[in-house]
């Protein structure tokens, strides 16, 4: 922390301007009034403060607003946002998308994923739900940021908004997030025709249950291997060789390369070797011919 000193009369600050770049840290601490700083935050980003000087300005704001900054200050943080921790951001209440845009622009090119994720979370909380305007802002200014939201926050996305989500926005989504988004996407695209539906639903399929994957296998979709590899293991394991063949179409030839990777490896272990051989790829590891498969889990459930 900066030690307290009194401000020399000639250094007294009446407005935030470029002259402050010549102030030492302790002079800034002593001479800049926090309320003045907050009122003139819109000027701060235009002044080439050092990171050390920004630390002092942040300290001033923290003292003035121990419960979290008001949005009027947050909107104009500019490069001061780079000094914020997720803990600082958690105290904020942000509702304006202009504020979100401004801070997303500042964070670009900096390692701030935790801060950005917290900021987006605060925006969703502040606005009450993840509405279309928020999704549009995220996809435009922060591709991939949608996946930084928790499954709980994503559950506030209305299905009508799903159409605004692009495939690349889902690249970093984990299984739990796709579990939340998939049923919404299914609902949003339910009135589309087969091929159009598949194109739209494809990025969300990492959250699809077995029944839906089986249904797709009956629709001549020719699922590409990258999409197949992103399906839930639990959704893939119950599929038969014939269903996988129909689901992938010509893409089934790519299974050979993925033979050792999940979910293909786990799926192979559950198939009869005879059936795997029909794929013509030399896939190995299936259940040998003549072996009887006992599903003990069924017996346990009955007893």
């Amino acid at each position: 922390d900066v030690e307290r000193t009194t401000c020399p009369p000639e250094k007294e600050v009446h407005e935030i301007d470029e002259s402050l770049i010549f102030y030492k840290k302790r002079e800034l601490e002593a001479c800049v009034d926090a309320a003045l700083l907050a009122a003139q935050m819109d000027r701060v980003d235009a002044i080439p403060f050092t990171y050390e000087q920004l630390d002092v300005l942040k300290h001033k704001l923290d003292e003035l607003y121990p419960q979290g900054y008001p949005e009027s200050v947050i909107r104009h943080l500019g490069h001061l946002f780079l000094k914020m921790s997720p803990e600082d951001i958690r105290k904020w209440n942000v509702t304006s998308l202009e504020t979100l845009k401004a801070l997303l622009k500042v964070s670009k090119g900096h390692e701030m994923s935790a801060q950005v994720a917290t900021l987006i979370d605060r925006v969703v909380v502040g606005r009450g739900q993840l509405d279309k305007d928020t999704v549009d802002t995220l996809t435009a200014f922060c591709p991939g940021c949608l996946c930084s939201l928790s499954p709980e926050r994503l559950s506030s996305v209305p299905p009508s908004v799903i159409g605004a989500v692009r495939p690349q926005d889902l690249d970093t989504c984990g299984p739990r997030q796709l579990d939340v988004l998939y049923p919404k996407a299914r609902l949003a695209f339910q009135n589309m025709s087969g091929s159009e539906y598949f194109v739209k639903i494809r990025p969300f399929l990492g959250g699809a249950p077995t029944e839906d994957v089986k249904a797709l296998s009956q629709q001549n979709v020719s699922m590409d291997l990258a999409t197949f590899m992103k399906l839930r293991r639990e959704a893939v394991l119950p599929l038969t060789v014939a269903e996988v063949q129909k689901l992938l179409g010509p893409h089934v030839e790519g299974l050979k390369v993925e033979e050792q990777h999940s979910p293909v490896r786990d799926w192979i272990l559950k198939q009869r070797q005879d059936d795997l051989d029909t794929l013509g790829l030399g896939l190995q590891g299936g259940i040998p011919n003549g072996y009887l498969i006992l599903d003990l889990s069924v017996r346990e459930a009955l007893s």
């Epitope: 291997l225 030839e253 390369v257 794929l279 790829l281």
Partner: antibody, heavy 121, light 107 residues
């Protein structure tokens, strides 16, 4: 070693059909799909389609769907391509090729010598 | 389908020199490109796969590079036996596609 043997030439009349063969040896025939490629005189290579030799399931380049029919005979480790309603446009060298599944969908590491098909009356 | 645009369609170079051929894919092919040498009366010969991986037995005069949609193939220290037509092949999609070919001649 791996070999794909194709007859050198075929001469057929317009409107007729022809069945080109590709006999594989040196590897397990049913472990690799067989692909067919066309090259017209003075032109580039064009992928026609492929076939799963284990279940006989073919996939075609849309341009050749009504022209080519791919089949296999597992007992003789031979792949066939029948070309129907032949015209001068079908005069070309036809290659069979075997993929190596090293990455993605596999690149072709073994090729036949090609069969030169001439369609002429 | 993925289109592969290969250029130039023909080129002439001196013995000992270097030539470069390019292939542009109509979409990202994730480095899944192979390069072939083709001489009359023979099947194409695989030189390079996965953008830059040299096949066993292929001299290091042959090299490949690229990512995304743009790829290149080079031959340095040109030798008389390099006279051939060269093709790129994308195998990022099961429906494979070739470039139009580049005919290499020696000056």
């Amino acid at each position: 070693q791996v070999q794909l043997q194709q007859p050198g030439t075929e001469l057929v009349k317009p409107g007729a059909s022809v069945k080109l063969s590709c006999k594989a040896s040196g590897y397990t025939f049913t472990n690799y799909w067989m692909h067919w490629v066309k090259q017209r005189p003075g032109q580039g290579l064009e992928w026609i389609g492929n076939i799963n030799p284990s279940n006989g399931g073919p996939y075609y380049n849309e341009r050749f769907r009504s022209k080519a029919t791919l089949t296999v005979d597992k007992s003789s480790s031979t792949a066939y391509m029948q070309l129907s309603s032949l015209t001068s446009e079908d005069s070309a060298v036809y290659y069979c090729a075997r993929p190596y599944y090293g990455s993605s969908y596999g690149y072709f590491d073994y090729w036949g010598q090609g069969t030169t098909l001439t369609v002429s009356s | 389908d993925i289109q592969m645009t290969q250029s130039p369609s023909s080129l002439s170079a001196s013995l000992g020199g270097k030539v470069t051929i390019t292939c542009k894919a109509s979409q990202d092919i994730n480095k899944y490109i192979a390069w072939y040498q083709h001489k009359p009366g023979k099947g194409p010969r695989l030189l390079i796969h996965y953008t830059s991986e040299l096949q066993p037995g292929i001299p290091s005069r042959f090299s490949g590079n690229g990512s995304g949609r743009d790829y290149s193939f080079s031959i340095s220290n040109l030798e008389p036996e390099d006279i051939a037509t060269y093709y790129c092949l994308q195998y990022a999609n099961p429906l494979r596609t070739f470039g139009g070919g580049t005919k290499l001649e020696i000056k």
